[in-house]
């Protein structure tokens, strides 16, 4: 009876996500068969989050709307380890929008999910950010410095990275 009600709950939760994510990849968390964590297929997972690399070229605002439709946001990078995971799936000759912007052009950077901007946990390329008109952040590869962040114009189409919390069922 307990297993039956648990299964019913899982099914109803899966239905919530079915509209945007028809297929989920789930793994058992720890030793308890009761707890599963899932990411939409073919998203990748790291710690408690799922990531999707969008290869369509769109403006920053449209990229964020696109992530939002999937129940996600443009990626918020909280640690060096997280960035190191993300870059494994990126192409060196491309740039990808992050969920970081400065809409007022006053160098008050803000993350899309309201995570406080911490200057100590940023990975700007040297000399960046460098232009008050460039109000959105990308991650890209520079041969001299490997992967890092750069400020660019928000209306310039780029690829992007979406991030969402894992789905627990």
């Amino acid at each position: 009876n307990f297993m039956y009600s648990k299964t019913v709950k899982r099914l109803s939760k899966l239905r919530e996500y079915q509209q945007y994510h028809p297929s989920l990849t789930c793994v058992m968390e720890g030793k308890d068969i009761e707890d599963w964590s899932c990411c939409p297929t073919p998203w990748t997972s790291f710690q408690s989050s799922c990531y999707f690399i969008s290869t369509g070229m769109q403006s920053w605002t449209k990229s964020q709307k696109n992530c939002s439709v999937m129940g996600a946001d443009l990626v918020v990078i909280n640690t060096r380890e997280e960035q190191d995971f993300i870059i494994q799936n990126l192409k060196r000759n491309s740039s990808y929008f992050l969920g970081l912007s400065d809409p007022g052009g006053r160098r008050h950077w803000q993350w899309v999910d309201q995570t406080p901007y911490n200057e100590n946990v940023t990975f700007w390329h040297s000399g960046e950010p460098n232009n008050l008109d460039e109000r959105c952040a990308i991650i890209n590869f520079r041969s001299s410095e490997e992967w890092g962040w750069n400020d660019i114009h928000c209306h310039v189409p780029q690829k992007s990275i979406c991030k969402m919390k894992k789905i627990y069922i």
Epitope: S59, K62, P103, N131, L132, R135, I152, H153, H155, V156
Partner: antibody, heavy 121, light 111 residues
Framework: EVQLVESGGGLVKPGGSLRLSCAAS????????MSWVRQAPGKGLEWVAT????????YYPDSVKGRFTISRDNAKNSLYLQMNSLRAEDTAVYYC??????????????WGQGTTVTVSS | DIVLTQSPASLAVSPGQRATITCRAS??????????MHWYQQKPGQPPKLLIY???NLESGVPARFSGSGSGTDFTLTINPVEAEDTANYYC?????????FGGGTKVEIK
């Protein structure tokens, strides 16, 4: 007072080339993105090219891509548009416009008087 | 590309009356309360002149009889009351993404 003065327009045969110039004054030219916008006789406005303040970014519509090149010389406070392989449909008044950024986009807050380009055999 | 459709294509208004021009975008040009739609006036033989930026902000030096409103895909420029010197073409422009695009224009004539 902000001023933008275009020059370099004229009559050119199809397949020919022209270089338009825009002399800027009254503001710190190097701090602003700039664009060229054109208007065919009796028609509406059509954006032609954009260059960022730092010269790091240029952008063109498909209609002129590969034929037109926007550039700037911040030391001379000047904007340029090199137009090659000109076609009859490029006939228009070409305006130089300053971009002012607002939030995630921008608008054109100052425009020059325009220079006329006529492509005809 | 985002397509902007202006209506009407032309209108004739008596002095002192209200003129209303609409601009419809093929997709939203708004984001988190910011509306990236702008309006320009162009008189015969002159370059365009900025009237309204970000849907509703009056550019410095523009008379208060000009106003803008709207969000998402639908925007309006209102001139109230219209004066004889307002005879011109009016254009909307979006800048939320490249390429920047303009509406086809609305010709306003004073009766």
């Amino acid at each position: 007072e902000v001023q933008l003065v275009e020059s370099g327009g004229g009559l050119v045969k199809p397949g020919g080339s022209l270089r338009l110039s825009c002399a800027a004054s009254g503001f710190t030219f190097s701090s602003y993105g700039m664009s060229w916008v054109r208007q065919a006789p009796g028609k509406g406005l059509e954006w032609v090219a954009t260059i960022s303040s730092g010269d790091s970014y240029t952008y063109y519509p498909d209609s002129v891509k590969g034929r037109f090149t926007i550039s700037r010389d911040n030391a001379k406070n000047s904007l340029y548009l090199q137009m090659n392989s000109l076609r009859a449909e490029d006939t228009a008044v070409y305006y130089c416009a300053r971009q002012l950024y607002y939030s995630y986009g921008y608008y054109f807050d100052y425009w020059g008087q325009g220079t006329t380009v006529t492509v005809s055999s | 590309d985002i397509v902007l459709t202006q209506s009407p294509a032309s209108l004739a208004v008596s002095p002192g009356q209200r003129a209303t021009i609409t601009c419809r975008a093929s997709e939203s040009v708004s984001f988190h309360g910011t509306h990236l739609m702008h309006w320009y006036q162009q008189k015969p033989g002159q370059p365009p002149k900025l009237l309204i930026y970000a849907a509703s902000n009056l550019e410095s030096g523009v008379p208060a009889r000009f106003s803008g409103s709207g969000s998402g895909t639908d925007f309006t420029l209102t001139i109230n009351p219209v004066e004889a010197e307002d005879t011109a073409n009016y254009y909307c422009q979006q800048s939320i993404e490249d390429p920047p695009t303009f509406g086809g224009g609305t010709k306003v004539e004073i009766k």
